[in-house]
Interface confidence: medium
């Protein structure tokens, strides 16, 4: 369990940099995370909205906090979901 946990952690932390990348090859991963963020109402992988770097401007309403039931915080003057997606992804992987 702890070994697979560590591998998942390392993989997610490694892939965080893909969110701020601008190449076509990273786009698929970014779009998968966007879907995940929408579904679980979280933002980014490790550091929240900051993980998206300049892409935060390219995907409008990327992490927009629209759900009153979830904690929000301000980022670059925008209300975004406070929770990062890493724990949701780990839970999701554990259940599947």
């Amino acid at each position: 369990k702890s070994k697979s946990d560590r591998i998942v952690n390392e993989t997610l932390y490694e892939n965080t940099k893909l969110l701020s990348a601008t190449g076509e090859s990273e786009k698929q991963f970014q779009e998968a995370i966007i879907v995940f963020q929408e579904e679980f109402k979280c933002c980014g992988l490790v550091n929240g909205a900051a993980d998206w770097g300049n892409n935060f401007q390219h995907y409008p309403e990327l992490c927009a906090c629209l759900d009153k039931q979830r904690p929000c915080q301000s980022y670059n003057g925008k209300q975004v979901y406070k929770e990062t997606c890493i724990s949701f992804i780990k839970d999701f992987l554990a259940k599947n």
Partner: antibody
């Protein structure tokens, strides 16, 4: 150039149904949340519904909840609004707008008239 | 009854400065950005101000927006006859999980 073109409006009897479409072009449709806003004759703007880029979240005004359904087809760059159990008070020009927390582009609107 | 409150009308003469107010609550203006829309007679609305005070490209700097607490305002300086239109403020409302508009202000020049 961003373009939004609504269609599907018309005259319908109370209790009837109508499906509005909004064809989008000039931007990457799948990156953007989209919304519907309406305006009754001589009245102000009223937000109707919004949908996130990948349809993961949908939001509705209380006045249409349970009767209207928003959807999108990213492969066709098209936004939809399925309107059921229509009432006289749903009579309005329906605008399709880009985004959900700022409406930065609007279509020209399509008129829906609910009358017997 | 609109969630955001605007005066129904405002007026001014060419060259004058006019201000339109928009009052909301902590769940809308108090916690989210305000946008302003201009609707010229017989046309679709157009984004005039976003994120409280930013102008989209193409909007003259005669238009400016500001926000303080749960209120926002739109100022138009150097009024022109072509500014005659309906102006609406709007913001996302966290309590309603929906977007809310003001009732609109009809500006007469």
């Amino acid at each position: 150039e961003v373009q939004l073109l609504e269609s599907g409006g018309g005259l319908v009897q109370p209790g009837g149904s109508l499906r509005l479409s909004c064809a989008a072009s000039g931007f990457t449709f799948s990156n953007y949340a989209m919304s519907w806003v309406r305006q009754a004759p001589g009245k102000g703007l009223e937000w109707v519904s919004g949908i996130s880029p990948n349809s993961g979240n949908k939001y509705y005004a209380d006045s249409v909840k349970g009767r209207f359904t928003i959807s999108r087809d990213n492969s066709k760059n098209t936004l939809y609004l399925q309107m059921n159990s229509l009432r006289a008070e749903d009579t309005a020009v329906y605008y399709c707008a880009r985004r959900s927390t700022i409406f930065d582009y609007w279509g020209q609107g399509t008129l829906v008239t609910v009358s017997s | 009854q609109s969630v955001l409150t605007q005066p129904p009308s405002a007026s001014g003469t060419p060259g004058q400065r006019v201000t339109i107010s928009c009052t909301g609550s902590s769940s809308n203006i108090g916690s989210n950005d305000v946008s302003w829309y201009q609707q010229l007679p017989g046309t679709a609305p157009k984004l005039l101000i976003y994120d409280n005070s930013h102008r989209p490209s193409g909007v003259p700097d005669r238009f400016s927006g500001s926000k303080s607490g749960t209120s926002a305002s739109l100022a138009i300086s150097g009024l022109r006859s072509e500014d005659e239109a309906d102006y609406y403020c709007g913001a996302w409302d966290a309590s309603l999980s929906g977007y809310v508009f003001g009732g609109g202000t009809k500006l007469t020049v």
